[in-house]
Interface confidence: low
């Protein structure tokens, strides 16, 4: 067979679907690899071909599109399962070709079982809600294209195992679930079950997502440096170990990158010759506020090191702060017999 541009196995798009539910899977070629869409390809005389490799097998096989009730079908660039079975798990390939052109990509499809409380090995998307922020909504995800707009499905929402009805601050509104005032107690897994008819059959779509209640932007502040501060002086003798913690509190900010770093005499530790190590630890509050600690350590400090400027810097999308540590050389304690005695007028 002639050469084909093979994009390999696209593990970035590990598709998981529930057993015994409809699934529509778009050929990733048009979304991620090629510069044109299916309509353009089709009108240019290119044909889309599907085949698959079963789980734990090496043999590529054509997909059987002649199953009872058209259980597996193809429509434009979409592969349909109505519904899926557990043994549909495998690597699926879509290939676009004509006599002079060929391009293909494979992707893994995993059919997953769920229990009666919607627990499963499915990787769940996380939706973050701001704490005490007013009305916020989540929407039942990935249900577009399963039924025409003329079909009115029924949607039932669950928190964990429990159907959501008469909840204090959570109200189902069709495809949306509204949180009147999000609280920490609203953390958890929420499931929408969409039921719709098609050709005399009834199908269910189950979609679960994790809700995480996080700090509100109303309360967000620039980074706060707790240490170093003006109350602590790092007083050392040459030869001792110098340890200075930089502890910074960051409010939760959606999509913000929090940064903490030290400078020594205005330079990054990597840019200077002294033997310095920096260890970082990170902890989070229940609302995902973050505390970062970077400990600057010089094993055997010299008198030169004790004259340097040690500055902790912190930055988030809210702003930037910096604080210099107070470092000084310890004055040796006087030896009583000589210095103090002299002070008392002894000769």
């Amino acid at each position: 067979s002639e050469r084909c541009d093979d994009w390999g196995l696209d593990t970035m798009r590990q598709i998981q679907v529930f057993e015994d539910e409809p699934a529509r899977i778009k050929c990733p070629l048009f979304e991620h690899f090629l510069k044109f869409n299916y309509s353009t390809a089709h009108s240019a005389g290119l044909t889309l071909i599907w085949y698959w490799t079963r789980q734990d097998r090496d043999l590529e096989e054509p997909i059987n599109f002649r199953l009872p009730e058209n259980r597996i079908s193809k429509e434009k660039d979409v592969l349909w399962f109505r519904p899926t079975l557990l043994n549909d798990t495998g690597n699926y390939t879509c290939m676009l070709r004509n006599t002079t052109y060929c391009s293909k990509v494979a992707f893994p499809l995993e059919v997953v079982q769920k229990d009666s409380c919607f627990n499963s090995p499915m990787k769940l998307p996380v939706h973050k809600l701001y704490i005490e922020y007013g009305i916020q909504r989540i929407t039942c995800p990935n249900v577009d294209g399963y039924f025409p707009s003329s079909v009115k499905p029924t949607i039932t929402w669950y928190m964990g195992c429990y159907k959501i009805q008469n909840f204090n601050n959570v109200i189902p509104e069709g495809m949306n679930l509204s949180f009147l005032i999000a609280l920490i107690s609203n953390n958890g897994n929420y499931t929408c079950v969409v039921t719709y008819p098609e050709n005399g059959r009834t199908f269910h779509l189950t979609r679960t997502l994790t809700v995480k209640v996080v700090g509100s932007p109303k309360n967000a502040v620039p980074p706060v440096i707790h240490s170093p501060n003006d109350h602590v002086v790092y007083e050392k003798e040459p030869g001792e170990e110098l340890l200075i913690p930089c502890t910074v509190y960051f409010s939760f900010l959606m999509d913000s990158r929090n940064e903490v770093w030290w400078t020594i005499d205005g330079k990054k530790p990597d840019d200077i010759t002294i033997d310095v190590t920096i260890n970082e630890s990170i902890s989070h509050s229940r609302t995902e506020d973050e505390t970062r600690t970077q400990i600057l350590s010089i094993k055997k400090v010299t008198s030169e090191d004790l004259k340097r400027s040690y500055v902790c810097h912190a930055r988030s999308a809210k702003g930037e702060v910096a604080k210099a540590a107070k470092v000084k050389q310890k004055v040796p304690a006087p030896r009583y017999t000589v210095e103090l005695a002299c002070g008392f007028g002894a000769t």
Epitope: P222, D255, S256, R257, E259, W261, K268, S309, V311, H313, R315, A317, K318, G319, E320, V321, A322, K323, A324
Partner: antibody, heavy 119, light 113 residues
């Protein structure tokens, strides 16, 4: 507005201090005050920034470290000290401000001051 | 050091036409969106057009549009006017932890015919 001053014709090896003065405004604690230069007929080149809220937050372009020093002289003045000048430092030097949250770009620029290094 | 590569230069456009300038960063800008666009005319300082990759600066006409994230950004000028003839620069803000915080692209000259 921002106004740069101190530009001059100097010989290679000389030092020079440029001053950026704000009129009608004073630098707020969330302002980044920066120096950017532009050689004749060339593009913009970042030199250094100082975070007005904390005079220890100072950033330099790698090439500028050691020869250039940015400092905040007052609530309305930022300076750039330049040492060991070479012909390659000939440029218009702009003072620029980025205000508010980080990532807002430089929304206020001075007209620039010309530094010419020539023997 | 961070590098911002602008293409193409120069670019020529007819009045009423559309100009697209791209800016590619050697590594992701801070928070994926800390990229600004400037317009500069001869003898003048730069003027901020776009910040945070896509937010229009105050007083800038809506025919200027910024898009992109991470390392790939675009400035689009639609309905080009003769007054848009200038050099356009992208400017990225990067993590200050590892390297230079700020870098400018090399500039793209826009000629309006």
């Amino acid at each position: 507005s921002l106004e740069e001053s101190g530009g001059d014709l100097v010989k290679p090896g000389a030092s020079l201090t440029l001053t950026c003065t704000a009129s009608g405004i004073s630098f707020s604690s969330s302002d980044f005050m920066c120096w950017v230069r532009q050689a004749p007929g060339k593009g913009l080149e970042w030199i250094a920034c100082i975070y007005a809220g904390s005079s220890v937050s100072i950033y330099y372009a790698t090439w500028a470290k050691g020869r250039f020093t940015i400092s905040k002289a007052s609530s309305t003045t930022v300076t750039l000290q330049m040492a060991s000048l070479t012909v390659a430092d000939t440029a218009t030097y702009f003072c620029a401000r980025s205000t508010g949250s980080v990532g807002r770009g430089f929304n206020l620029w001075g007209q620039g001051t010309l530094v010419t290094v020539s023997s | 050091a961070q590098v911002l590569t602008q293409t193409p230069s120069p670019v020529s456009a007819a009045v009423g036409g559309t100009v697209t300038i791209s800016c590619q960063a050697s590594q992701s800008v801070y928070n994926s969106n800390h990229l600004s666009w400037y317009q500069q005319k001869p003898g003048q300082p730069p003027r901020l057009l776009i910040y945070s990759a896509s937010t229009l600066a105050s007083g800038v006409p809506s025919r200027f549009k910024g898009s992109g994230s991470g390392t790939q950004f675009t400035l689009t000028i639609s309905g080009v006017q003769s007054d848009d003839a200038a050099t356009y620069y992208c400017q990225g803000e990067f993590s200050c932890v590892s390297a230079d915080c700020i870098a400018f692209g090399g500039g793209t000259e826009v000629v309006v015919k």
